[in-house]
């Protein structure tokens, strides 16, 4: 018995060859002897039933002269999985057709961190093995159900699943979209008084995007977190529902999600969590955003540089006179110089020599007041 593997929705060609290598009478039947189609000597294809019933079945007339009488089944269905009989030259050829399908669990658009389940639809009696390769080249192998937990952004793209049955292969391609923000976390460094821009770009594009979101903010100086803004998303249009009065936030009306804080102030320094709930999706998308604010001041004979917000312990805060070595450099959130000499002083926040934030303050001779450019 010949085995042919097919993919649901596609076409399969079931072979039937004559030893004569020339046109001859042939008939294709179901295993219960119902006739599908055939050729009875006049070179005309005769179907075994009404056109509507048999419109998916065909043969290759061009191959008949070469002694080949294939049965073509179009738009394959799972229930086409059965034994087909080709009768020619007083013999019967049995061809077993197994139709397979690989589906993703409920949806091909999944939230980051969710699980992807790939299910092989297979006919009874088949004993397939499946191997699926993710877009980043990771292979998973198993029986009729394969699961990948904790989907990552790199899992977005085309998954290729190979079904192996009796040394024959059939390949499926499934496009998976992992719904996530481009960055899980971001940090913004600003001098006091500067305008702050927060951006939350999505790592996917879809026709229509509907949902709702909220930004909760935990200021370093505050004892509890506070909802800064809530908004709706309708077909990629953003509409603000509720916004805090302090700070006076503004939100862009289009994607990517974009927030503007008019002034960076020490009392706003801290961490925020933007949550986006998408329509018809269980679970939410999250992006963390952090704000670090720097202030340089001179009070009487003390020049001070301070930062507020979530800084890592390895960050270095320095005070230096322009074009000179740092006067003070510490892994602290505040540094100061007593009786600073006149000139342009720089306050620098750096990470392994790379400057993240810089604030300049001009120290005038002792008889005048300081100038902050």
């Amino acid at each position: 018995k010949t085995l042919v593997l097919g993919k649901e929705g596609e076409s399969a060609e079931l072979p039937c060859e004559s030893s004569q290598k020339k046109i001859t009478v042939f008939t294709w039947k179901f295993s219960d002897q119902r006739k599908i189609l055939g050729q009875h000597g006049k070179g005309v294809l005769i179907r075994g039933g009404s056109p509507s019933q048999f419109d998916r079945f065909d043969s290759k007339k061009g191959a008949w002269e070469k002694g080949s009488f294939p049965l073509i089944i179009n738009k394959l269905k799972m229930e086409d999985s059965q034994t087909y009989i080709c009768e020619l030259e007083n013999r019967k050829e049995e061809v077993e057709l197994w139709v397979f399908k690989v589906t993703a669990n409920s949806d091909t658009h999944l939230l980051q961190g969710q699980s992807l389940t790939l299910t092989l639809e297979s006919p009874p009696g088949s004993s397939p093995s499946v191997q699926c390769r993710s877009p980043r080249g990771k292979n998973i192998q198993g029986g009729k159900t394969l699961s990948v937990s904790q989907l990552e952004l790199q899992d977005s793209g085309t998954w290729t699943c190979t079904v192996l049955q009796n040394q024959k292969k059939v390949e499926f391609k499934i496009d998976i979209v992992v719904l996530a923000f481009q960055k899980a976390s971001s940090i913004v460094y600003k001098k006091e008084g500067e305008q702050v821009e927060f951006s939350f770009p999505l790592a996917f594009t879809v026709e229509k995007l509907t949902g709702s979101g909220e930004l909760w903010w935990q200021a370093e100086r505050a004892s509890s977190s506070k909802s800064w803004i809530t908004f709706d998303l309708k077909n990629k249009e953003v509409s603000v529902k509720r916004v805090t009065q302090d700070p006076k936030l503004q939100m862009g009306k289009k994607l990517p999600l974009h927030l503007t804080l008019p002034q960076a102030l020490p009392q706003y320094a801290g961490s925020g969590n933007l949550t986006l709930a998408l329509e018809a999706k269980t679970g939410k998308l999250h992006q963390e955003v952090n704000l670090v604010v720097m202030r340089a001041t001179q009070l009487q004979k003390n020049l001070t540089c301070e930062v507020w917000g979530p800084t890592s312990p390895k960050l270095m805060l320095s005070l230096k006179l322009e074009n000179k070595e740092a006067k003070v450099s510490k892994r602290e959130k505040a540094v100061w110089v007593l009786n600073p000499e006149a000139g342009m002083w720089q306050c620098l926040l750096s990470d392994s020599g790379q400057v993240l934030l810089e604030s300049n303050i001009k120290v005038l001779p002792t008889w005048s007041t300081p100038v902050q450019p």
Epitope: Q82, T117, K144
Partner: antibody, heavy 125, light 107 residues
Amino acid sequence: QVQLVESGGGLVKPGGSLRLSCSASGFTFSDYYMNWIRQAPGKGLEWVSYISSSGITIFYTDSVKGRFTISRDNAKNSLYLQMNSLRAEDTAVYYCAREDYSNYEDHYYYYTGVWGKGTTVTVSS
Amino acid sequence: EIVMTQSPAALSVSPGERATLSCRASQSVSNKFAWYQQKPGQAPRLLIYNASTRATSIPARFSGSGSGTEFTLTISSLQSEDFAVYYCQHYNNWPYTFGQGTKLEIK
């Protein structure tokens, strides 16, 4: 532990309907293909229907085609068999059974490893 | 549809003795073949799958052999709990079919 419990059987008149349920526990139901198998009184076993883990692929034995409908609800860990136009010859104990598999040298072997205790359906006037 | 024929229909054997049950398929089913044991009022219990692989927690006295169309279940030394009805079944293609059963009785 792995368990399948059938319910919904009973006495019904010819032409009537019944809905059998099978409640699964102790395993990830949504990962497994499921089956209904029946056994007429004092007779042998007969396969009735087969459903894939997602519920997309379904097969029936010829004698029940068009009358019986197999379905599943993975969220509820439940398998169902809706039986319409019942006949006297449908009288049997109906078993719910799980399709298991083993893997040997990357070859997969499928078999029916876990069965419920069965529920009795009697079709009589 | 593949027809499974079991022989004998009934078999009387004394405890401690060997029992051999046969099953023939009307066409080749490769090794997609299983044996089940059923006791009165109970569901069938899988003994052997893939023609020769013992299912979990099945004693070593049960063994299966054969391929294609001829299959054998051997119980090397019968215990009192082994007296039951035994069914063979193929799972080569749809519909899966069972044999009519062999009743193993105490002699």
